[in-house]
Amino acid sequence: AGVFELQIHSFGPGPGPGAPRSPCSARLPCRLFFRVCLKPGLSEEAAESPCALGAALSARGPVYTEQPGAPAPDLPLPDGLLQVPFRDAWPGTFSFIIETWREELGDQIGGPAWSLLARVAGRRRLAAGGPWARDIQRAGAWELRFSYRARCEPPAVGTACTRLCRPRSAPSRCGPGLRPCAPLEDECEAPLVCRAGCSPEHGFCEQPGECRCLEGWTGPLCTVPVSTSSCLSPRGPSSATTGCLVPGPGPCDGNPCANGGSCSETPRSFECTCPRGFYGLRCEVSGVTCADGPCFNGGLCVGGADPDSAYICHCPPGFQGSNCEKRVDRCSLQPCRNGGLCLDLGHALRCRCRAGFAGPRCEHDLDDCAGRACANGGTCVEGGGAHRCSCALGFGGRDCRERADPCAARPCAHGGRCYAHFSGLVCACAPGYMGARCEFPVHPDGASALPAAPPGLRPGDPQRYL
């Protein structure tokens, strides 16, 4: 079970010359309402035939009065969706009729008068649970824009609303042979109830109440092996092992009919009965037109009504193929640059950028240092999507705002004592060592491994090298 939902976006004059006159006037104000009728399959039944899938009527729209001399604009619409509940499986292919009705609100005796303003019809393929499909239909000089979808009502799920979901009995997993119900991962698929008596070994069902046979079995309950029915074959020599007639080669062997055509023998050869949209001796010629509703996933059909005419489907984001039948993994093309994370949201593609990058595809490398000041005379250094400050002597931290303790790293070697100084640090070297960091030993004879200390400084005195 589920609901077919129809959203009317606009009803107004179509493009091109010959705009229709407004259906309402100052003398006869009116309001619109819509009726939708659904039938299963790609039927071409008359508009009057029953709406086997269901029908719905919208609320009345706002009252509209034409402005004299103005062209007919898009007319005000009723609020909300038209909803058509369906009790059984969603058929996947369906026919629709959408009627636009005018309710005249003049001073008619006996209440308002209704008249049919426009009727559009079409045949479409649609999977339940899919995205909203958008459509544009013309009726004379009028144009109707609308969206539609089919959704399952819990506990039903799946493209036909035939799989059932039940809350899990055990917290961790589903029972044997039963899958979790995506997207309701906390629920489990319930087993289908097939036709009573359907062979559990040789039969199965995809919809409640049916019994479909595995290969090699036949009969209403799949209890009859096919080998016994081959004894009834009218052709071929008798087989000594089974006592059955083994069919000889016939013109339909291997089914010469393409595209799902069914083959029947004729006195001289064979004949293919082609499915809708195909023709030719072997059903090899596609005569699909937009009237056959060939577009999936909300694709919009473009093409002529003539069987020779080409057609194609204008696909919504996330789908491709002549019939929009293929879902695109758009992230597999790695559209996000500079290590950005790709997110396919269905209706759009988003890139989540790493720090330091921006743009729809993370293609812009931000100037890491732009607007980033390093304090106290530090200079900004760019790199890898982040900024770093190279700080002046005596300062540290991310932005050089912290006064550094130059002695924290114990820079004076060989037991030298460190003194912080406004311009850096000073090392007072232990006896026998010299240099800015007390790194050089003084030779015992008084000679140094480096040039002697500047005049006026004895080895062991604090030395300051600026």
Epitope: I312, P316, V328
Partner: nanobody
Framework: QVTLRESGGGLVQAGGSLRLSCGAS????????VGWYRQAPGKQRVLVAV???????NYAHSVKGRFTISRDNAKNTVYLQMNSLKPEDTAVYYC?????????WGQGTLVTVK
Amino acid sequence: QVTLRESGGGLVQAGGSLRLSCGASEITLSDKTVGWYRQAPGKQRVLVAVISNVDSTNYAHSVKGRFTISRDNAKNTVYLQMNSLKPEDTAVYYCYARDFEAEYWGQGTLVTVK
């Protein structure tokens, strides 16, 4: 109102070739489904070649193998390469583009095959 500009039509001998071009200045064709319809005198318009917004192509049975539709996004132009032309290809060829919001037509270009 946006119109598409067709060019490349003309008179050609049977068996010859022509290349039609369809350009637009106010709209981008790369994200549209673009096709070529033709209309012979006294007949209805038939879509002979079409390229979708996701670059799938399709052709009318009568031109399959002879006509090729392609697009050049940099030039915002769609082409119809017509080879092995036959007298029955004589028609006015119209460029057509559409997306979910709107549709656009050209004025048409005449192709005559003698």
